[in-house]
Amino acid sequence: EEELQVIQPDKSVLVAAGETATLRCTATSLIPVGPIQWFRGAGPGRELIYNQKEGHFPRVTTVSDLTKRNNMDFSIRIGNITPADAGTYYCVKFRKGSPDDVEFKSGAGTELSVRAKPSAPVVSGPAARATPQHTVSFTCESHGFSPRDITLKWFKNGNELSDFQTNVDPVGESVSYSIHSTAKVVLTREDVHSQVICEVAHVTLQGDPLRGTANLSETIRVPPTLEVTQQPVRAENQVNVTCQVRKFYPQRLQLTWLENGNVSRTETASTVTENKDGTYNWMSWLLVNVSAHRDDVKLTCQVEHDGQPAVSKSHDLKVSAHPKEQGSNTAAENTGSNERNIY
C-alpha cells in the first residue's frame, strides 16, 4: 500500500478579522494509526493549535468527526480570527508510539492571512490657534488594518488637498499596520465653518471609506477689525462714541475704553451678533461728558481678543466748541452695547 500523504490543498487562506478560518487537511491512508496535530510554524518553537488526543483548544473545532474509524479528514475551523493569528499552519500526522507518539509526516502548510479593518481615522490639529493666511498642519491616524495596501485622502470642504505626507508602518511584514498622514492647510478668513476630512479606503471596507474630521473652528483665530465713530450729540454736553468690533472669532474678547490714556471702562463681549461666515460682530459705546474736559479728548477703544496682544483704535474728540459746565465731576457715562446706563 502507498505510504500515507498529508494533503493541505490550500497554500493560503484569507480571512476577515472576527470570522472563522477553515484550514483543510486530509490523509491519503488510515495507516499508520496515530493522531493528527495542528501547529503554527515549522520549527521546534512551533505553537500547538490542535491536538486530536488531548488539550484545551476553545477556538478550534473539527470539520468532521475524528472519532470515526475511517475518518481521513482532519480539517479544522478556528473561530474569531484576529491579525495575531496570521502565520503558516501545518497539519502533522503522528504514529502511535510508546511512551510518546512519533511525528510521521507533515502537510505542506497553509498560510493564513487576516484581513482587518482600519480603526476610525482620528484627525488632530495644531495645539494653538492660527490666523488667516497661515499654514497649519493636521495629522490623521488609523491603526490595526491588514493587508498593508491602503489609500488616504485629505479634503477641505469637499475639495481634495494635495499637500500631505503619508507613512504606513511597519515597512516589512506584520500582522497589522498603521497609517499616519500630515496635511498642510492654508487658513482663510472664511474658515470658521470649514472642515478638514481625512478619508481612508481599504479592501475590508468594501468601497465605503472611513472618515475622520476636524473643525477649523477649533484651529482658526480671526482677529477683529475696529472702527471708532462719533455719533450725533445726544444732549447738549454729551457725545456718544461707538467702537464697532467686526469679524472676529472665537468670541472671547475684552474691550477697554481709555480717555486720554486713562482706563474708563472694561467689558467682556456678551451679546454678540453672528455673521454668515461664523465670525462675530460686537459694538460698545461710550457717553462722554464733554463739559468735564477743558481740552480735546483722545478716546481709545482697546481690544484684547482670545488672549492675544491688544489692538486699539483712537478717536480725537474736539471739545473747544462746547461750553464748559461748572461743577460736573463725571467725565463719562459708560454705556455698554446692551443699551443700559451704568451710573
Partner: antibody
C-alpha cells in the same frame, strides 16, 4: 497576564547538581515551546535549551550531556536538571516562552546559579 | 552556525540624541532578525522582530531596518529609560538560537 517565575538557584561546588523550576501562568502552557536562556555576570545572552510542545528537546553544545530540560504540562512547570556543574555555568538562568516564529516574547526575572569551590 | 556581531560595544549619548546600533550576520538571514532591550537587574524585553516590526507596546521612536547581513536599530530622541543593553537575535527555525554580543547605550 503571562507570568514566568524561576526558582531553585543557589551556590554549588563544581561537579554538583541543581534543579531549576519555572512556574508558568497566564497562557496555555502545553501549547508553547519553552526555553532556558542564561547570562553570565557582565556578559551577553546565551540560549541553553528548548523543549517543544511534543516534548522534543534541544541543547546548546556547551551543556549537552549534562543538562536535561523537561516539562510537566499538568503543573504548568518547566524544569532544568543541571548535573556536573562547572564554574563557567555561573549565570542568571531565565525561563522564556518562545513564539511560533522564534521570538522570546515573555521572560521570567531569572534565578542565579553560582558554581564555586 | 551563524554569528551575529554587534557594534559598537558601548554608545555614549545624551538624552534627546539619536542612537544607531548595528548588528551584522556572518551570512544572509533574510529579514529574520529581532532586537531585545535589557535594563540592569531586569529580564530582556522584545522590541522589534522581522527586522522592522515593533512588538506590542513599543514606542515608535524605536525602529529597525536592514536585510541580508546588515541590520540597524535606531532610537530617535533617546529618553532616560532607553539607556540599557540591546541584543539582536536571529529568528531561525531551529536551535541553537543565536544572540549578538550586545550594545550598551549609556548616558554621556
Amino acid at each position: 497576564d503571562v507570568q514566568l517565575v524561576e526558582s531553585g538557584g543557589g551556590v554549588v561546588r563544581p561537579g554538583e547538581s541543581l534543579r531549576l523550576s519555572c512556574a508558568a501562568s497566564g497562557f496555555t502552557f502545553s501549547n508553547f515551546a519553552m526555553n532556558w536562556v542564561r547570562q553570565a555576570p557582565g556578559e551577553g545572552l546565551e540560549w541553553v535549551s528548548l523543549i517543544s510542545v511534543t516534548a522534543t528537546t534541544y541543547y546548546a553544545d556547551s551543556v549537552k550531556g549534562r543538562f536535561t530540560i523537561s516539562r510537566d504540562n499538568s503543573k504548568n512547570t518547566l524544569y532544568l536538571q543541571m548535573n556536573s556543574l562547572r564554574a563557567e555555568d555561573t549565570a542568571v538562568y531565565y525561563c522564556a516562552k518562545v513564539t511560533w516564529n522564534n521570538l522570546f516574547d515573555y521572560w521570567g526575572l531569572g534565578t542565579l546559579v553560582t558554581v564555586s569551590s | 552556525e551563524i554569528v551575529l556581531t554587534q557594534s559598537p560595544g558601548t554608545l555614549s549619548l545624551s538624552p534627546g540624541e539619536r542612537a544607531t546600533l548595528s548588528c551584522r550576520a556572518s551570512q544572509p538571514i533574510d529579514s529574520y532578525l529581532a532586537w531585545y532591550q535589557q535594563k540592569p537587574g531586569q529580564a530582556p524585553r522584545l522590541l522589534i522582530y522581522n527586522t522592522v516590526t515593533r512588538a506590542t507596546g513599543i514606542p515608535d521612536r524605536f525602529s529597525g531596518s536592514g536585510s541580508g547581513t546588515d541590520f540597524t536599530l535606531t532610537i530617535n530622541r533617546l529618553e532616560p529609560e532607553d539607556f540599557a543593553v540591546y541584543y539582536c537575535q536571529h529568528q531561525y527555525d531551529w536551535p541553537p538560537y543565536i544572540f549578538g554580543g550586545g550594545t550598551k547605550v549609556e548616558i554621556k
